[in-house]
Amino acid sequence: SIPWNLERITPPRYRADEYQPPDGGSLVEVYLLDTSIQSDHREIEGRVMVTDFENVPEEDGTRFHRQASKCDSHGTHLAGVVSGRDAGVAKGASMRSLRVLNCQGKGTVSGTLIGLEFIRKSQLVQPVGPLVVLLPLAGGYSRVLNAACQRLARAGVVLVTAAGNFRDDACLYSPASAPEVITVGATNAQDQPVTLGTLGTNFGRCVDLFAPGEDIIGASSDCSTCFVSQSGTSQAAAHVAGIAAMMLSAEPELTLAELRQRLIHFSAKDVINEAWFPEDQRVLTPNLVAALPPSTHGAGWQLFCRTVWSAHSGPTRMATAVARCAPDEELLSCSSFSRSGKRRGERMEAQGGKLVCRAHNAFGGEGVYAIARCCLLPQANCSVHTAPPAEASMGTRVHCHQQGHVLTGCSSHWEVEDLGTHKPPVLRPRGQPNQCVGHREASIHASCCHAPGLECKVKEHGIPAPQEQVTVACEEGWTLTGCSALPGTSHVLGAYAVDNTCVVRSRDVSTTGSTSEGAVTAVAICCRSRHLAQASQELQ
């Protein structure tokens, strides 16, 4: 029967008595930087070309016995997970292996850097189709390794890496912390985070998604027909590399940004038990388990968006946090979040010719996060309209006044230390969808975009009594671009998007009286692109 991990990533329409999805990734080459591998194993023979690249440190210990099958174990298994005939994800993908890990599974930053440079030079000498680079390794944070990954990604290569097996914040490790890399955590057959001894999968905002990574059956280097079960984020990353190969084989022109958005979009949502993660990491960690798209074509009409969290600002009074979108993505909205509730809001601002989302800490606050909503919107022309704090008691307002521009997000930022100490404004008039409204002491920022066929609408959900969390979701066919809380509530910790749902979090209700100040309203801006829908119909 089909192994659990292949069943998990396979949409129901492909689930026959064996796993045989349409194209097997045959147009894609996957580079594997790992241990040596047994390339003539029955599961992968003819699929893996062992390059002559080898850069590994000496094995530790004078009594270390180099046993060939052990040296090949990790890499052989991963090659089998990516492209194995019977237990592989992308059965048609061809692979090239580079040896950067020794027989004990240890490598160096310099060895990995030289390996990445080898790939870059190979690509220049002999350009092939789409390339996926699988980095099933994790070491301490390295600025230089992250920079090398960024260079390769900007040359059009898709890099997939293991989040790491340290039961820790993936942002503390490289290449997991490189924003351009697709970073993968591991889940088990119950869709729970993988525990490995006293440790387990890494987590946090640097993880893009999770994938099967426990009891994964794959090629064993013990013999040419053997299989073995292995666990870890390396196995999870190998699944995503295989899925990426399948998607790129079906749509070779996909950019890294498009691929990442599709991986997120087609993932299983909200199936992971977040209680496994440390409390402060739960909101930052994506609740996503990778899956193949139900159809390898026809996804182009959707407006894809993802949520990007910044690093924590730190607690100093003037501390700020910045969240950035990838080069090919548009920042459509910006929000902020603070566990203490002490923040001075957020704003979108230009930095290096691109909009970024900046959140501001407040005096006495423990720090803030900036949350960017990053979307794929071809031919978009977006700008930020700002209204300074208003004199009138009705509060501050700003709208999209340019012809053809629609509102995709609202942000507010204030100079006073805590708006909670100020009298809230009266509620603003309803039915003005192209308008952002805020406290009179706040400056309000509207994200206004023009793109062919783009249409947006505002959706609100208000709860009169205090609630720790209020949500509002966009309906089928619409994509959440903006998420904010209505002004007038003193205890809001912040707002953020989770998939297609806008979440507004408040302080513990036990500390808040149920006055009118206790009311919480979540505001979602939901958009769709008729232009993308028409374009995809013409292609079919």
Epitope: E18, Y19, Q20, Q38, S39, D40, R42, E45, G46, V48, M49, V50, A68, R85, D86, K91, C223, S224, T225
Partner: antibody, heavy 115, light 109 residues
């Protein structure tokens, strides 16, 4: 061009040994092992075993255990199949083929065991 | 391992389609995606026609197709031609080795 070229025909007496060679060219040797298959006159194909060009590991069919030895010499890109204690029912055409997938075959070597 | 079961012979007229079956068990045909089909003309080495159940090597006519259901694999030849007359063998992985079918003689009438 991917090619497997086998040694010439052999006539052996019962109890003797025979060693058939198979020289591979036109591909990355370590990406595939070599399978050995035999076909007795008027009979079907029988898989005998496999040898790795990568590390010399072998995988023998149960029927052959103890009588067959498969080796390889990477320096000459050649794989070998030696069959000992020959019997008359070992008379067959012996083929080498690339890997377990057996996508490319040698031309065959006829081994006749006769007293 | 015992050989996979194939019909001893099948025949068809030029232009017709024929199907050759290959029955095994869940430990071979049913358990792996790696069923191959070989064509062998008299006095010649076998030639790979289908691999991994349904894939055709480059250079093999698209008149040849493969499929699998449960423990039985099938080779279909459409638009039968005189040069298709040959012996056909199926082959499958087992847990530790490889097993061939007994062979099917195809006669083009």
């Amino acid at each position: 061009e991917v090619q497997l070229v086998q040694s010439g025909a052999e006539v052996k007496k019962p109890g003797a040994s025979v060693k058939v060679s198979c020289k591979a060219s036109g591909y990355t040797l370590t990406s595939y092992g070599i399978s050995w298959v035999r076909q007795a006159p008027g009979q079907g194909l029988e898989w005998m075993g496999w040898v790795s060009f990568y590390n010399g590991n072998t995988n023998y069919a149960q029927k052959l255990q103890g009588r067959g030895t498969m080796t390889r010499d990477p320096s000459t890109s050649t794989a070998y199949m030696e069959l000992s204690r020959l019997r008359s029912d070992d008379t067959a055409v012996y083929y080498c083929a690339r890997g377990y997938g057996m996508d490319v075959w040698g031309q065959g070597t006829t081994v006749t065991v006769s007293s | 391992e015992s050989a996979l079961t194939q019909p001893a012979s099948v025949s068809g007229s030029p232009g017709q389609s024929i199907t050759i079956s290959c029955t095994g068990t869940s430990s071979d045909v049913g358990g792996y995606n790696s069923v191959s089909w070989y064509q062998q003309h008299p006095g010649k080495a076998p030639k790979l026609m289908i691999y991994e159940v349904s894939n055709r090597p480059s250079g093999v006519s698209n008149r040849f197709s493969g499929s699998k259901s449960g423990n039985t694999a099938s080779l279909t030849i459409s638009g039968l031609q005189a040069e298709d007359e040959a012996d056909y063998y199926c082959n499958s992985y087992t847990s530790t080795s490889m097993v061939f079918g007994g062979g099917t003689k195809l006669t083009v009438l």
